[in-house]
Structures are given as structure tokens and as C-alpha cells.
Amino acid sequence: AITEAREEAKPYPLFPGPFPGSLQTDHTPLLSLPHASGYQPALMFSPTQPGRPHTGNVAIPQVTSVESKPLPPLAFKHTVGHIILSEHKGVKFNCSISVPNIYQDTTISWWKDGKELLGAHHAITQFYPDDEVTAIIASFSITSVQRSDNGSYICKMKINNEEIVSDPIYIEVQGLPHFTKQPESMNVTRNTAFNLTCQAVGPPEPVNIFWVQNSSRVNEQPEKSPSVLTVPGLTEMAVFSCEAHNDKGLTVSKGVQINIKAIPSPPTEVSIRNSTAHSILISWVPGFDGYSPFRNCSIQVKEADPLSNGSVMIFNTSALPHLYQIKQLQALANYSIGVSCMNEIGWSAVSPWILASTTEGAPSVAPLNVTVFLNESSDNVDIRWMKPPTKQQDGELVGYRISHVWQSAGISKELLEEVGQNGSRARISVQVHNATCTVRIAAVTRGGVGPFSDPVKIFIPAHGWVDYAPSSTPAPGNADPVLII
């Protein structure tokens, strides 16, 4: 039979009976929850008939009394079998056993779910000696129960290497539903279905779930936990939560925001980190990612010169590290630069355009049509050339550098001359007769010295030779010319 005790106005007496300190009688539930102490009486079940020691684990003593009568088997008296109470309430339960006085050093230990309870637990053992037996009452109390206190509690006593085990006392802590799985924030594609999960447990069970979207109940009738909500798609951000209900009341999950993935906002603060003649290093601050990670970015570059054809160069790069070196640009040119980035939904608009300029560079080509001839009367070598095309000067010409190398039997010396930017001719003194003079010319800007022209060689004869002719830069691909006079 199951005996029940529900809340009453007066507390249950603890251990009324013959022993001082209140030893229980067999028919009294082993639970005292006096209202004055802040405890609420709880629901209890006693699984065995009152008055009978349990038949579980008993020790039959081998010792006999003076009259040689065998001692009765030792066993814990039956106790309340099931205590149901609310979270944060207090509870006290106990085991009792009568032990013949011939046994010494009897100790009772408490165990929960197969593990011994040591240390900080509030367990008290009281002894009530009589002529032949000692009543031992072991009490266990919890001042404010939590869910973790749920479980099966037993007492153990060792006598003569025999272990006596009490019936279990099941503690069931009931409270509001407790979430084991709550909905998670998500970023979703517009108008695409997705799932949210909510799970809560008691006791008491069952736990029923209601879903709430933007303060409106999605399901008007409860669903048993766990519950999966299929949201049929969203067109704008929404907040979801779930309510878990049981007989104790209602717990509401955290509200989670579900965002709609969108194209990113345009990058901001595009800035020039460094400029060279042919490259510009830019950085940018990414815009809002539209709830979807950036995949890559596109740098758009157009010449700012109003006379340019307006074509746009596009450079693709990874989204990180928000830095890109734009190459293959013209020197001393103005450019408009914009940045756009994309996520899985699409491309952002282009950032505000910024103006950037490349610096002067060294010319990219050498002077053209270099010719060299000997002016014997003045003992000079005359050099003429054409300046490189303006586009390839990569800056403002400040002049030219002439390299002339004189070679005769076993001797070689190189000399360098600087020439102002206005001319396209130069005269150098003959350094050695009966020698070959090799001439190369490079254009110079503030950005540096450009490449030298292909070498032009002229033979300078010993004094008194009359015949001579100019030497000039060869057509591309021909071998270096040598003029023999």
C-alpha cells in the first residue's frame, strides 16, 4: 500500500515513542517539516507495510545471550520511501535501527545513488542506549533542496564485517521547468525555412512547450518537450523564445534574434597607405557584413584625367586583411578608387570614391635614336638622341646620364656625364686614341634614372686618320654596331 502525506496545517511529529530524543514508531512517517522552521511539508510515499523491518540486507548475529537465545536479525526499520518537494524547500529524513549492546563502534554512513556522502552534508547520528539495545537514529537534512539533490538515499551500517543496508529513500525535487536546450540566434536567408529547438525537463513532467515569435504565440496549443519549430521563412528580423510549462509553473527561455542575411553595406574610410610610381597601397574599413561573412572584395580604379576613356580597372582580392596594393599603374597619374565587398547574398555598393596619385618614377624607356660621331677637328665625340615618349618618362625630365666606356689594348675606363633636360645632344672629349668608345644614355627624372639605351660604339683612331662616319643605335634585335674607321 502507498501511504501519502500531503501538506497539512500542523507538522508531523518526529520520532514519537519510547526513546528520549524522539525515536520513531513504525507507523509514523519519517519526515518532520515544521512550518516554523521554514519547511513546507512534502508528499511522501512509504513503500512497505508499517511495522515490518525490511527484508533487504540484514545481519544475523552469531552471538547468543546468557540464556543462549539467538539474537534477532538486525535490520533498519522501514522508513518513508519517496519524498516529493519543491526546489529550495528544506527536508529531513532518517534511518533508525536497534542494535544489541554487545556490538561496539557501530557507525552509520549515508549514500546517494551508490556514492558515499562525505564532508559537508548535514548528517547527525544519535544514540539512545537501553538495557539490552541501543536505538540509533541517523538523520540527514538539506536546508534548501536543489535539482542535484534528486536521487536515492540509503543508510549503511557495518557489523561483524556484515553490511546492513536500509531501504532507499527517493528524493524528488520538483520545480519550474529547466531548459536543457534553448533556441539559438541565427542568421538566415530571406524567405527560407529553418528550425529552432527547445527542450525543458521537470520534474514534474510532462513539460509542455509554447513558441513565441515577436510576442505572438506560434502554437496555441502546447507541444510536449522537446519541440522543434519549423519557421516557414522570414522577411525581417524576428525575436523568438519558448515557454516551458509544467504543474509548478512557467519558465521562459532567453529571447533570440533571428537576422535576415542581406548584402553588405559599402566599405568606409578607404585611405591611401602608400604611393609609388606604379602602385598604390590602400586600406578600408569594412561596412556591416549583412549577417553573412564577407567572401571577397573588389577594388575599382579609374583614371581621374578628364581626357581618359573612363575605363575601369578591377582588382579582386580576399576580404581580409582590408588592405590591397594596386599595381601596374602609370606614374605621376591621378586615379579614383572605390571598394566593394561581397557576402553570400551579393555585392555591396561601392564605397565613396577617393582620389589618389602615383609618384614620379624613373623613366621606363631609354632615349631613342642615339647617334655618335667623331669631330676630329675639336677632338670631341658628338652624341645626339631623341627624348623618350612623354607617357614613358614617368615624371618630369631633369636631364640625362651618359655613360661612355673607353677600351684599348688591355685598358678600360668608364666615365659618366650629366646633361640638363633641355638638350638632346652632348659633346664629350676624346679620352683615348686608337680605342673604342661605347656610349649609352639614360633619361633622368626626380624619380630616378631610367634604363640605358643600347650601346653605340665608335672607334677613335690614332691622330692623323681622316675617314670617319657616325655610329648610331641599331634597329632592335641587331648586334651591337662597331664602327671601324
Epitope: 524567405n191 513558441w211 515569435q213 515577436n214 505572438s216 506560434v218 502554437n219 496555441e220 496549443q221 502546447p222 507541444e223 519549430l229 519549423t230 516557414p232 521563412g233 522577411t235 524576428a238
Partner: antibody, heavy 118, light 106 residues
């Protein structure tokens, strides 16, 4: 398959009462709320309210508070609509319909015509 | 309560034509459902939650919209589509229906 079968047409005099039934089959009756929708002759659809088949709690739209009562007999998976003190303007087809998430009416009864005429 | 206004009230169209019915809510709603009702029949769910086709509904029907403006589109109308169409909102109690749009086939 899911079916909602309603009771037959009724002809009533003003002041009388009528009780329309809606028997559900093909699903667990207590899992989904039961709604009632009215359609007067030649008119559109009007949501009257619903009854929670799990708790038995009814909810009435403002225009249907008072003379209209929703009830259940879960043992036979049936919902009822009772209208008392009938008036001529109660003449309409009354539909029962189930909904789940997001209150779309996936299943409808065939409708019950209630005619109130002296 | 949220008032739903459908337009047009009535439309006469020829087969294969594209038809658009709009439903405007007096304030923002989360979802719009659409129903088709033929004479002497119960309403039938066509579109649930704004844009999701109910089972067994031909793909020529589609729904779209958000906030206060929603649309039911029938691409390439067929003779069997002659019916009255109703929108119904979810998001604010009480649930409300539009007044209906009657579609006649020429």
C-alpha cells in the same frame, strides 16, 4: 487522412438554440486547436474564435462573445458550436477548421448551414 | 484589430493571363495566408506564411510580400482557378480575413 465532418443543415426559429458538431479523424484531436469560422450568404469569412482541445479553454472574437459557446467531447474527438437566442442575422454557413503553427487553416469541415427564419 | 483590404474586389480575366491580387494590412503583420473558395465548397489553403505553397497546390500560384503589403500571383490562369480568394493574417489577435477577391474567367 485528416478529416473534419460537420453535422447537417439546421432550420431554426428566432430565439431558439442550435448545436453544430465537428468530428475530427486522422490525427490526435488534442494536438491542434479547433477554430470556428462564419460565412454569411454572399459574404466573406469571419473568424469566430477557437477552443483549446488540450485544456478545453475557449477564446471568442469580440463579435462572438455572449450567445456563442465552444465545447468539446475529447472522447469522441468532437468539437461543438452552440448558438443561443438565434437571430435572423445568424443565418450563415459555419465552418470548423484546425490550425497548428502560425494559425493557417490547413483543414476545414464541409460547413453547416444554419438558417434562422420565422 | 488588423483590417485587411484586398484589391481588386472583382476581376474578370482570360485564361493564360497573369493575375495579381494584393492584400494590404492596416498595420504590419508577420505572415499572410491565402485561401481559395469555390462556390458551395469549403475554403482551401493555397499559400501559407506569405510564400509557401500548401501541399497539392499547383506551382502557378505564388505569394510574396512583407510588413503591410502582400501579393498572391497566379501565373497563366486556368479555367479551374475561377473562385474567390481570401487573405488571412497571423501576428496580431484576433485573426482576420480580407473581404475576398472574386476571379471570373472570361
Amino acid at each position: 487522412q485528416i478529416q473534419l465532418v460537420q453535422s447537417g443543415s439546421e432550420l431554426k426559429k428566432p430565439g431558439a438554440s442550435v448545436k453544430v458538431s465537428c468530428k475530427a479523424s486522422g490525427y490526435t484531436f488534442t494536438n491542434y486547436g479547433m477554430n470556428w469560422v462564419r460565412q454569411a450568404p454572399g459574404q466573406g469569412l469571419e473568424w469566430m474564435g477557437w477552443i483549446n482541445t488540450y485544456t478545453g479553454e475557449p477564446t471568442y472574437a469580440d463579435d462572438f462573445k455572449g450567445r456563442f459557446v465552444f465545447s468539446l467531447d475529447t472522447s469522441v474527438s468532437t468539437a461543438y458550436l452552440q448558438i443561443s437566442s438565434l437571430k435572423a442575422e445568424d443565418t450563415a454557413v459555419y465552418y470548423c477548421a484546425t490550425y497548428g503553427h502560425y494559425a493557417w487553416f490547413a483543414y476545414w469541415g464541409q460547413g453547416t448551414l444554419v438558417t434562422v427564419s420565422s | 484589430e488588423i483590417v485587411l483590404t484586398q484589391s481588386p474586389d472583382f476581376q474578370s480575366v482570360t485564361p493564360k493571363e497573369k493575375v495579381t491580387i494584393t492584400c494590404r494590412a492596416s498595420s504590419s503583420v508577420s505572415y499572410m495566408h491565402w485561401y481559395q473558395q469555390k462556390p458551395d465548397q469549403s475554403p482551401k489553403l493555397l499559400i501559407k506564411a506569405t510564400s509557401n505553397l500548401a501541399s497539392g497546390v499547383p506551382s502557378r500560384f505564388s505569394g510574396s510580400g512583407s510588413g503591410t503589403d502582400f501579393t498572391l500571383t497566379i501565373n497563366s490562369l486556368e479555367a479551374e482557378d475561377a473562385a474567390t480568394y481570401y487573405c488571412q493574417q497571423w501576428g496580431t489577435k484576433p485573426l482576420t480575413f480580407g473581404q475576398g477577391t472574386k476571379l471570373e474567367i472570361k
